[in-house]
Amino acid sequence: MGRARDAILDALENLTAEELKKFKLKLLSVPLREGYGRIPRGALLSMDALDLTDKLVSFYLETYGAELTANVLRDMGLQEMAGQLQAATHQGSGAAPAGIQAPPQSAAKPGLHFIDQHRAALIARVTNVEWLLDALYGKVLTDEQYQAVRAEPTNPSKMRKLFSFTPAWNWTCKDLLLQALRESQSYLVEDLERS
């Protein structure tokens, strides 16, 4: 990617000092998607455009960071700037030329799924691995993969083995894992959502 980050930086550098201050204040109260935290007020208010861009991208990733920036700009009445930002990020989304359906492997880097975002916590905290395996068997996991995960001695090593297969999974496969987690350890999913 990178283009979204550049587009955010470009937008923020075009704000006057007063507008940048207003942008930061609005950022403190703008509604956020569930699962995302707020940039701490103390750090935020002292940042210049470059620092703020880096912080937006590290907190919200490029795509949502750009969307959030555009939302705040729009809220400030800077419709044209918001439009330019979104146009710039859409340009860089890796879309195929008009009329050509790009194959999945050349797809733009998709948004981060809950499963990917909380990989480390899931490896450490999932205890009901056998139940997950049964839920995923035949839908997402082959017999060979199922056996390989089951052969691991501990829950964390089982989950690590399971995650070794996820790079090849599409969004719907990850959704099925998340559904299984919600059904078997809903308290854990709830906790991760709040984190």
Partner: antibody, heavy 122, light 107 residues
Framework: EVQLVQSGAEVKKPGESLKISCKIS????????IHWVHQMPGKGLEWMGY????????MYNEKFQGQVTISADKSISTAYLQWSSLKASDTAMYYC???????????????WGQGTLVTVSS | EIVLTQSPATLSLSPGERATLSCHAS??????LSWYQQKPGQAPRLLIY???NLHTGIPARFSGSGSGTDFTLTISSLEPEDFAVYYC?????????FGQGTKLEIK
């Protein structure tokens, strides 16, 4: 502003094929799932399935699996719902919808198309 | 699949009154329930998500509660524009399912 604009009403005969569309604007098309919801005249809502344009994968309600195909064209930010052979029972309003967010796959539909009325009659 | 049963099927009330709509799930769905309003000839509109979260732009007279299998949508004081059909929807597991709807009509 997030917008989902659907293609116009269709009148078809049983056995004919059809592809309806949902054109998306106002956000990055590849970041969110697009869902299709079916509503027969005077009846309730029924989820048909979704597509995730980021990787082209689709999830179907088993009831509709094999009856319809959900697809997307990233180059024009458009999702599709298609039938190869329509039946009279396919007569319904079809809505495309986008969730509030797809991050945790809690699919609350915050954004809706205006609906496409499909009438299948001989 | 998870079946959602809404009650009552029809609710007849007057503007200014309090409306209480119920949604019962056939199995535990934790808090993964949303509520929609639909008026004739219009697409549904999200009111509440995740049982109790008020969607942006929805008036505060709407509120949601519940977890597990029993959920409630409350409209504290009915306005004329609130008379419509209301649907609940679960997001716990696939297929996603909706309730059959409650029609809120003017008495």
């Amino acid at each position: 502003e997030v917008q989902l604009v659907q293609s116009g009403a269709e009148v078809k005969k049983p056995g004919e094929s059809l592809k309806i569309s949902c054109k998306i604007s106002g956000y990055s098309f590849t970041d969110q799932t697009i869902h299709w919801v079916h509503q027969m005249p005077g009846k309730g809502l029924e989820w048909m399935g979704y597509i995730y344009p980021g990787d082209g994968s689709a999830m179907y309600n088993e009831k509709f699996q094999g009856q319809v195909t959900i697809s997307a064209d990233k180059s024009i930010s458009t999702a599709y719902l298609q039938w190869s052979s329509l039946k009279a029972s396919d007569t319904a309003m079809y809505y495309c919808a986008r969730p509030l967010y797809s991050y945790a796959s809690y699919y609350w539909f915050a954004y809706w198309g205006q609906g496409t009325l499909v009438t299948v009659s001989s | 699949e998870i079946v959602l049963t809404q009650s009552p099927a029809t609710l007849s009330l007057s503007p200014g009154e309090r409306a209480t709509l119920s949604c019962h799930a056939s199995q535990n769905i934790n808090v993964y329930l949303s509520w929609y309003q639909q008026k004739p000839g219009q697409a549904p509109r999200l009111l509440i998500y995740k049982s109790s979260n008020l969607h942006t732009g929805i008036p505060a007279r709407f509120s949601g509660s519940g977890s597990g299998t029993d959920f409630t949508l409350t409209i504290s004081s009915l306005e004329p524009e609130d008379f419509a059909v209301y649907y609940c929807q679960q997001g716990q597991s696939y297929p996603l399912t909706f309730g059959q709807g409650t029609k809120l009509e003017i008495k």
